[in-house]
């Protein structure tokens, strides 16, 4: 019962975690920033893995995908890859774990098979969670590094003067969603691995072999008739025990030299 509960809880926790990883990957609020400020209007910017949006205090909002941008940070591509790998592994893990659930009966699947599937899905959830946590952490590090590197400076460009503006930036909601979701997926995976130990039957290394008496174990008595080896009366000399397997000597009607006691 405890094993089933651990497995079920692990599945639910991982399911919530993977849903969170998907949500975080799709969210636009990975980082937020004030791009422009004056006494009348403010331009607020939020960026995701796939697009960047500007929102003004007037209510105007515009989002633009990064496909228009040349030279995206390599780190961004790495974060995208980590999040996608996390989602794919998590999805496969969920699929495997559904069939591994003890409360679901599929044909004559043995406990050992379910244990193996539970372990597999558990490992997949752990790796999925780690991918998400790594992806979010790499992004957070990239953000901090980039903002510290681009401190206020001014230089002369082709069209005049270029100045880097110091703006306030914060980690977006998606980072926290990603960290929590990755953690939940990781915990769910650990729970599945723990459940696997309880599911695996304690098998011995040998098989018990049972021996059955043959259906034609007979004794010879003077008078030439076949006596029964069974219990009770057998006046008609009928076969009392049939082991189920039909042998070659079963076709013989009379005792012969090949019949053994």
């Amino acid at each position: 019962m405890a094993v089933t509960a651990c497995q079920g809880l692990g599945f639910v926790v991982s399911l919530i975690g993977i849903a969170g990883i998907i949500a975080a990957t799709c969210m636009d609020q990975w980082s937020t920033q004030d791009l422009y400020n004056n006494p009348v209007t403010a331009v607020f910017n939020y960026q995701g893995l796939w697009r960047s949006c500007v929102r003004e205090s007037s209510g105007f909002t515009e989002c633009r995908g990064y496909f228009t941008l040349l030279g995206l940070p390599a780190m961004l591509q790495a974060v995208r890859a980590l999040m996608i790998v996390g989602i794919v592994l998590g999805a496969i893990g969920l699929l495997v774990s559904i069939f591994a659930l003890k409360c679901i009966r599929i044909g004559s699947m043995e406990d050992s098979a379910k244990a193996n599937m539970t372990l597999t899905s558990g490992i997949m959830f752990i790796v999925s969670g780690l991918c998400a946590i790594a992806g979010v952490s790499v992004f957070a590090n990239m953000l901090v590094t980039n903002f510290w590197m681009s401190t206020a400076n001014m230089y002369t460009g082709m069209g005049g003067m270029v100045q880097t503006v110091q703006t306030r930036y914060t980690f977006g909601a998606a980072l926290f969603v990603g960290w929590v979701a990755g953690g939940l997926t990781l915990i769910g995976g650990v729970m599945m691995c723990i459940a696997c130990r309880g599911l695996a039957p304690e098998e011995t290394n040998y098989k018990a072999v049972s021996y059955h008496a043959s259906g034609h174990s007979v004794a010879y008595k003077p008078g030439g008739f076949k006596a029964s080896t069974g219990f009770g009366s057998n006046t008609k000399n009928k076969k009392i025990y049939d082991g189920g397997a039909r042998t070659e000597d079963e076709v013989q009607s009379y005792p012969s030299k090949h019949d053994y006691v």
Partner: nanobody, 120 residues
């Protein structure tokens, strides 16, 4: 790299009008805001007017009611229509373009400036 080019400056009589143009070109992700600043001889550079991508405008008190800033997002161009000009409006007018740089701090690009002289 973004190139900023101003035009439309010149000599104008007091009470007259002038229309300044500023075009941004080059490779950039998105222009967040464009504006005009001016610098009179021996003075600090001061804000005249700005306009955001969404069309929100802001005017300095000195030019309020006498100027109109407008923008063409498709052409990445900003215009400043100045009316009822006074001799104290004489200055070099600079165009400012704020560009969003994803995952970095935004950049401000400045033009070389266009001279506006209000004199009789």
């Amino acid at each position: 790299e973004v190139q900023v080019q101003e035009s439309g400056g010149g000599l104008v009589q007091p009470g007259g009008s002038l229309r300044l143009s500023c075009a941004a070109s080059g490779s950039f992700f998105r222009i967040v805001a464009m504006g005009w600043y001016r610098q009179a001889p021996g003075s600090q550079r001061e804000l005249v007017a700005t306009i955001t991508r969404g069309g929100s405008t802001y005017y300095a008190d000195s030019m309020k009611g006498r100027s109109t800033i407008s923008r063409d997002n498709a052409k990445n161009t900003v215009y400043l229509q100045m009316n009822s000009l006074k001799p104290e409006d004489t200055a070099v007018y600079y165009c400012n373009v704020r560009v969003e740089v994803p995952f970095m701090q935004p950049n401000d690009y400045w033009g070389h400036g266009t001279q506006v002289t209000v004199s009789s």
